[in-house]
């Protein structure tokens, strides 16, 4: 209209999706009577009547706003509920009297996008790619208006960089009118990026101001060629025979190349390939001294067939050889002396110890054990232990049995055995001496002899209990070149009154556990039946 003043800028009303917009008609009393107002929405420069106010009473017009409009503030404000992105437009109120004036309101709608969803390239990126490769994608769903995306690497924003960094973004409009932003980061990566942390950030605006949401941080699988190959041995430190040793090949490339482990043959000086397990690890179990030697690893890039060799690594499996004792089977007269000498080889310095077998008592620290004025009790086992003090658990031992010449010793001199008439009795008798004795019985029966050790013998006799046997008892006699000795077994009939509830009526004599060095009057460790009651 000629001469009409330029329209003032509309009032800005900002509101979040889903909430209520309060559209206040800003007409002054001079411009119009608020009890008689028409409200319009303007879309693509087309006005549509949406609401009428007459005498302060409101009435919605049929259409998209019919159910969402109401009057507030004594008719000065129009409330629009459940705001959607499609409501972002100009609304105007027009007063009818005294003359037609209008007031314009620009409704701005906002919605925060969902948390950005980042997905990393699941196949990884080679460092030698010819152009920027897809690193990760970022999706920000259901925002309004379109959020802005910023990509970060190690906390620093990434900028477009020709042939190095390219960010490609697009948006789609959902049926709700909200935007989904999709962005893909393409970059040329270097080996150092294997640990780089990438994330995307969405920047958006709300009525309350500017905001941002960050995705989780991701690392990208980066592929780079192997430059260095090396061997690693577990366990670290000194190795000993019997250990489980693992030799593995390591490389600084990703993915790891194909490996083979070789050992230098000491005679030919040629490298011979060793058999590794499925993981490419050479397992030596148990490790032996023959495993000592020079190992190296070869790595192949199967694409280029270029191979790399590791620095050789010397492996030392420490050992102690079999221990030798001389004399190996010593025999001595009572009162004489004996020198026992122990020898062994090792990859390390050795320490020797002599121990008494029966008691584990340390007799000597050193390879030589001197024994003087030998008594019969000195017979038995002596153990030489050769050990490497610097490697706990690395030791070998050798046992030597010293025999002292002497007539037989009996495990017991006499013993009472409870029997029942007509039972088959199992009797045993033990004796020791050097030379080893033989045992004979003074009654007929089935006898069997068992050698317990070079100086000790156990004889067992099965015999039927007869009245004569009860009368005479049983004797066992042990004899060798140097003499003889006898043990007596007295047989006593078992009365019912002599039995206790837990006693065994068929008990014979259990094998004595007395050692060859036990005195003849030593107590037996077998369970004895109670003494018979006295009969008056």
């Amino acid at each position: 209209v000629p001469g009409e003043a330029e329209q003032p800028a509309p009032e800005l009303v900002e509101v979040e999706v889903g909430s209520t917009a309060l559209l206040k008609c800003g007409l002054s009393q001079s411009q119009g009577n608020l009890s008689h107002v028409d409200w319009f929405s303007v879309h693509k420069e087309k006005r549509t009547l949406i609401f009428r106010v007459r005498q302060g009473q409101g009435q919605s017009e049929p259409g998209e706003y019919e159910q969402r409009l109401s009057l507030q503030d004594r008719g000065a404000t129009l409330a629009l509920t459940q705001v959607t992105p499609q409501d972002e437009r100009i609304f105007l109120c027009q007063g009818k009297r005294p003359r037609s004036q209008e007031y314009r309101i620009q409704l701005r709608v906002y919605k925060a996008p969902e948390e950005p969803n980042i997905q990393v390239n699941p196949l990884g990126i080679p460092v030698n790619s010819k152009e920027p490769e897809e690193v990760a994608t970022c999706v920000g769903r259901n925002g309004y208006p379109i959020p802005q995306v910023i990509w970060y690497k190690n906390g620093r924003p990434l900028k477009e960089e020709k042939n190095r960094v390219h960010i490609q973004s697009s948006q789609t409009v959902e049926s709700s009118g909200l935007y989904t932003l999709q962005s893909i980061l393409k970059a040329q990566l270097v080996k150092e990026d294997k640990d780089a942390q990438f994330y995307c950030e969405l920047n958006y605006r709300l009525p309350s101001g500017n905001h941002m949401k960050e995705s989780r941080e991701v690392t990208v699988p980066v592929f780079y060629p192997t430059e260095k190959v090396w061997l690693e041995v577990e366990p670290v430190g000194m190795l000993k025979e019997g250990d489980r040793v693992e030799i593995r090949c390591l490389a600084d490339g990703n993915p790891p190349p194909h490996f083979s482990i070789s050992k230098q043959n000491p005679s030919t000086r040629e490298a011979e390939e060793e058999t590794t397990n499925d993981n490419g690890v050479l397992v030596l179990e148990p490790a032996r001294k023959e495993h000592s030697g020079r190992y190296e690893c070869q790595a192949w890039n199967l694409d280029t067939m270029i191979s790399l060799l590791s620095e050789p690594q010397e492996l030392l499996v420490n050992y102690v050889s079999d221990v030798r004792v001389s004399p190996a089977a010593p025999e001595r007269q009572e009162g004489s002396s004996l020198t026992l000498t122990c020898e062994a080889e090792s990859s390390q310095d050795l320490e020797f110890q002599w121990l008494r077998e029966e008691t584990d008592q340390v007799l000597e620290r050193g390879p030589v054990l001197q024994l003087h004025d030998l008594k019969r009790e000195a017979g038995g086992g002596y153990r030489c232990v050769a050990s490497v003090p610097s490697i706990p658990g690395l030791n070998r031992t050798q046992l030597v049995k010293l025999a002292i010449f002497g007539p037989p010793w009996m495990a017991f001199k006499e013993r009472k055995v409870w029997v029942k008439e007509n039972m088959v009795l199992n009797l045993s008798c033990e004796a020791s001496g050097h030379p080893r004795p033989t045992i004979s019985w003074n009654v007929n029966g089935t006898a069997s002899e068992q050698d317990q050790d070079p100086q000790r013998v156990l004889s067992t006799l099965n015999v039927l209990v007869t009245p004569e046997l009860l009368e005479t008892g049983v004797e066992c006699t042990a004899s060798n070149d140097l003499g003889k000795n006898t043990s007596i077994l007295f047989l006593e009939l078992v009365n019912l009154t002599t039995l206790t509830p837990d006693s065994n009526t068929t008990t014979g004599l259990s094998t004595s556990t007395a050692s060859p060095h036990t005195r003849a009057n030593s107590t037996s460790t077998e369970r004895k039946l109670p003494e018979p009651e006295s009969r008056g």
Partner: antibody
Framework: QVTLKESGPVLVKPTETLTLTCTVS????????VSWVRQPPGKALEWIAA???????YYNSAFKSRLSISRDTSKSQVVLTMTNMDPVDTATYYC????????????WGQGTLVTVSS | DIQMTQSPSSLSASVGDRVTINCKAS??????LAWYQQKPGKAPKVLIF???SLQTGIPSRFSGSGSGTDFTLTISSLQPEDFATYYC????????FGQGTKLEIK
Amino acid sequence: QVTLKESGPVLVKPTETLTLTCTVSGFSLTSNGVSWVRQPPGKALEWIAAISSGGTTYYNSAFKSRLSISRDTSKSQVVLTMTNMDPVDTATYYCARRYGYGWYFDFWGQGTLVTVSS
Amino acid sequence: DIQMTQSPSSLSASVGDRVTINCKASQNIYNSLAWYQQKPGKAPKVLIFNANSLQTGIPSRFSGSGSGTDFTLTISSLQPEDFATYYCQQFYSGYTFGQGTKLEIK
């Protein structure tokens, strides 16, 4: 619209080499990566190989030494070769487009059944 | 390699039923998971990506949920055309598919 179509022999002999071609239309191979996925009769899907929009090639490590994937952008074709074929390689072979802003497959070819038999 | 295990391997249901199919990853894959539908003699078709986003053109009766190692595909009200085999696929590290769940008419 986006289409992918596999072509190649339906029958190969053991120890022979299989060559399959995937011809695409409706998109550019420099915008979307393409993968090959196979499915033995009555079995599950198995990813074989991929070529990215930038031309980087990727292989399933189970077949790596037998596979080669390449592309001819001017012909809109992706070629898969698989050497030393075995009867266990009998399957329907699909080529599939990787979605431009994600890592899943949004369009697939109809597949081609390859039988390995002497 | 990441293993994907689907359960059940087969399932009988009727039109109108609500159906859930589960997929378990052998390690955390965040939400790097897609669901596909395959009918006999046809190529797979993507239904869900990023664990819970519905692919354009797929009916809203299909929905996906879960993150980390446990995921679910739900069909809220089975339609006759939904009887097919369903596969989950991870794209967190390489690509691996589940063994499939065959959905049959009861």
